[in-house]
């Protein structure tokens, strides 16, 4: 049987050692001990009582069915308590009374039906973050479960098997920062919802079946309700229930985000808010995201037009990789506060992006990132872009482009540019000259010879220069990240001539170890200040006796450099 | 440059399976559609179905629900079509398209000729 | 299914004069302001090579005598001055709704 390995601060390892009961020889000097992935099954009451002194035990996926009830006694100091993903059929409060110290507790994935017979936590005074429940059999909560537990920054319940739900159960934590409820159905949605309004801040609601959700009025009295983020993770719905889950709006009048992430639409994008009040009531939400939504019938999906008036005030928007192909003109029109829109890993062709970005068009859009859709001309791409009048950041990474012509035409305001994993082996003229940052890494450039006035940041790298770009093209550049290109060597004088140049990444090229480089990187310890990857970074390529040396520690041979 | 290069002529006894493959170059694979077109001889364009490498998301022409499986391989940047319970009727040129913007086929490969025949 | 209709079936033109292939769904091809309709040419034992999508936009490497033009359900291409190398088959496709589906084809010839 293999054994522990444990480093000088106390921390030891020993996950998938083929363990079949706690290791003897554990001591105080321990400050965290990780048993994960082993074949435990038992833990008795002096396994683990000279562990006076540790903080943290992980014993996650160890087939432990039986713990003693003292077993933890001497665990005063303990902060992190994993035991996710064991045989524990019963939860025992004994278990938990030393854990005075508490602040992370998973009991996620064991067997057990019920939290147990008693509250487990009441002493549990400094728990921060709890997970708990299962797949298959955890079905009820009860109002004794959450007893003794006031405030909590993450709360976790998988409860995907859920039969009962008592009334109240949620309401005595006064305080959750983050709850994540994963919920097959949602039949006791409602219930929860007005348990949890007057404590959570931000409420993730994950695999959740919200085909059938119906609306009906909350149990609550007037509540100002902290919750500012509301997530949506596997979930599906339909038009119908979309219209229901946003009566749920008016009793989170705080909220700010909301974001959709790999949830399925089974509708067409037909919503119609029934009570016109829900537009006021998302009035604060200023961020709506959605990532990978799956709509089977994408083509047949509606303008949306029923809830433009919902939009109005949105100030960020991301719609990422979910096959987003044409957002109509009357769509971003309606969209007058918007600041950032995302539309990452679209389908988006700058032929089809011209009705989008349409006149009068997101007037407000500061930020659009289109990395990559299918977008194929850059010069299309600018001069469709034009209707933007306050656009100043543009990403449009990932696209594979022609061939760069000389003259574009791009919005008045814009400064960031980001043509990074394009494809382009030129850059010419058709970058405009107002950019303050320029980012052209990944790509296929073997010279950069473009005079850019006003750039402050270049990164330029996972490319194929050979020198570091001349500086007189850039009299105020800041930062330039020139990683993995072919650059063999920098001098003062090249340095130098950069006059108000801060930070320089320029590791994994290909340096040439000449008496020069060398001389210069001895003679200079400032380049620490202004080369952030130094030194480690900076390797010899050449000469052969040099190579794979740091230049830092390499030295030129008196020979060849005095010849 | 972009190349969706097919797999050569099948010729198959009715009743068995057939599996073309197209293979992608010169562009990230998971970013575009694949879509399947089918030419009966001397005859117009049917359009099969599509699948996307991102996700394995697909979508058929009911009139091939049962004829074709849609399946792809992002490591080796290849997708597939599996045609099951061949007759006369299946002899056709099939062809793999890159689907781009989500409404056109803009790189074609060259077409698999399919005889089914005893 | 949204049904194409292309006609003539064939037509015959003189090298250097305009060709016009209409093409008429069963259905409006519009998607809030875009007109889902492609032309595709096709050459004897070729794949079929996209010419237009959206209606009237020329795909890139298209010689400039071929364009699209119309909206809602009745379409043409167009090929002005026609060349020898266009005496081929023509189709158009739409993909406003699935299943996608092409026109019959038209076979230019000359006259």
């Known amino acids: 049987q293999e054994s522990l390995s444990c480093d000088a601060s106390g921390v030891c390892d020993g996950r998938s050692r083929s363990f079949t009961s706690i290791p003897s020889g554990l001591t105080a000097a321990m400050k965290s001990l990780d048993l994960s992935f082993n074949k435990i099954t038992y833990i008795g009451h002096g396994d683990l009582r000279a562990c006076a002194n540790l903080q943290v035990l992980i014993l996650k996926s160890s087939r432990i069915n039986t713990i003693e009830g003292d077993a933890f006694y001497s665990l005063g100091s303990l902060e992190h308590l994993d035991l996710s993903d064991n045989h524990l059929s019963s939860l025992s409060s004994s278990w938990f009374g030393p854990l005075s110290s508490l602040k992370y507790l998973n009991l996620m994935g064991n067997p057990y039906q019920t939290l147990g017979v008693t509250s487990l936590f009441p002493n549990l005074t400094n728990l921060q973050t709890l997970r708990i429940g299962n797949v298959e059999t955890f079905s009820e909560i009860r109002r004794i479960d959450f007893a003794g537990l006031t405030s909590l920054n993450e709360l976790e319940i998988k409860a995907l098997s859920l039969r009962n739900y008592q009334s109240q159960s949620l309401k005595s934590i006064r305080d959750i920062h983050h709850l994540t409820l994963h919920l097959s159905e949602s039949a006791f949605l409602l219930e929860i919802f007005a348990d949890i309004l007057s404590s959570v801040r931000y409420l993730e609601l994950r695999d959740t079946n919200l085909a059938r959700f119906q609306f009906s009025p909350l149990p609550v009295d007037e509540v100002s309700s902290p919750m500012k983020k509301l997530a949506f993770r596997g979930s599906v719905l339909t038009d119908e229930s979309f219209n229901e889950l946003l009566k749920l709006l008016r009793y989170i009048l705080e909220l700010s985000e909301v974001e959709f992430d790999d949830c399925t639409l089974n509708g067409l994008g037909d919503f119609n808010p029934s009570e016109s009040d829900v537009v006021s009531e998302l009035g604060k939400v200023e961020t709506v995201t959605i990532r990978r939504l799956h709509i089977p019938q994408f083509y047949l999906f509606y303008d949306l037009s029923t809830v433009y008036s919902l939009l109005e005030k949105v100030k960020r928007i991301t719609v990422e990789n979910s096959k987003v192909f044409l957002v109509p003109c009357s769509f971003s029109q309606h969209l007058k506060s918007l600041e950032f829109l995302d539309l990452s890993e679209n389908l988006m062709v700058e032929e089809y992006l011209k009705n989008s970005a349409c006149k009068g068009a997101w007037p407000s859009l500061q930020t659009l990132v289109l990395s990559q859709n299918h977008l194929r001309s850059m010069q299309k791409t600018g001069e469709i872009l034009l209707t933007l009048k306050n656009l100043t950041s543009l990403d449009i990474s990932r696209n594979t482009f022609h061939p760069m012509p000389d003259s574009c035409q791009w919005p008045e305001k814009m400064r960031f540019l980001n043509l990074s994993s394009t494809g382009i082996r030129v850059v010419k003229t058709c970058i405009p000259q107002t950019l303050e940052v320029l980012d052209v890494s990944n790509n296929n450039l073997d010279s950069f010879s473009l005079f850019l006035p006003r750039l402050q940041e270049l990164y330029i790298s996972r490319n194929k220069l050979k020198t570091l770009p001349d500086a007189s093209l850039f009299p105020v550049l800041l930062v330039m990240k020139i990683r993995e290109n072919a650059v063999s060597t920098f001098s003062k004088d090249q340095l130098g001539s950069f006059p108000k140049l801060e930070t320089l990444e320029a590791g994994d090229n290909h340096f040439v170890c000449s008496c020069e480089l060398l001389s210069f990187t001895m003679e200079t310890p400032a380049l620490a200040q202004i080369l952030v990857d130094w030194p480690d970074s900076y390797l010899c390529d050449s000469p052969p006796r040099l190579h794979g040396h740091r230049l830092q520690d390499a030295r030129p041979s008196v020979l060849e450099c005095h010849q | 440059q972009v190349q969706l290069q097919q797999s050569g002529p099948e010729l198959v006894n009715p009743g068995a399976s057939v599996k073309l493959s197209c293979k992608a170059s010169?562009?990230?694979?998971?970013?575009?559609?694949i879509n399947w077109v089918k030419q009966g001889p001397g005859q117009g364009l049917e359009w099969i179905g599509w699948?996307?490498?991102?996700?394995?998301?697909?979508n058929f022409n009911e009139n091939f629900k049962d004829k074709a499986a849609l399946t792809v391989d992002t490591s080796s940047s290849t997708a597939y079509m599996e045609l099951h319970s061949l007759t006369s009727e299946d002899s056709a040129v099939y062809f793999c398209?890159?689907?781009?913007?989500?409404?056109?086929?803009?790189?074609w490969g060259q077409g698999t000729t399919l005889t089914v025949s005893s | 299914d949204i049904v194409l209709t292309q006609s003539p079936a064939s037509l015959a033109v003189s090298l250097g004069q305009r060709a016009t292939i209409s093409c008429r769904a069963s259905?409006?091809?519009?998607?809030?302001?875009?007109?889902?309709m492609q032309w595709y040419q096709q050459k004897p034992g070729q794949p079929p090579k996209l010419l237009i999508f959206?209606?009237?936009n020329v795909e890139s490497g298209v010689p400039v005598r071929f364009s699209g033009s119309g909206s809602g359900t009745d379409f043409s291409l167009n090929i002005h001055p026609v060349e020898e190398d266009d005496i081929v088959m023509y189709f158009c496709?739409?993909?406003?709704?699935?299943?996608?589906?092409f026109g019959g084809g038209t076979k230019l010839e000359i006259k």
């Open positions: 959206g209606a009237s």
């Open positions: 496709q739409q993909s406003r709704k699935l299943p996608w589906t």
């Open positions: 699948i996307y490498p991102r996700d394995g998301s697909t």
């Open positions: 259905e409006s091809v519009e998607y809030y302001g875009t007109s889902l």
């Open positions: 398209a890159r689907l781009t913007g989500g409404t056109f086929l803009d790189y």
């Open positions: 010169g562009f990230t694979f998971t970013t575009y559609g």
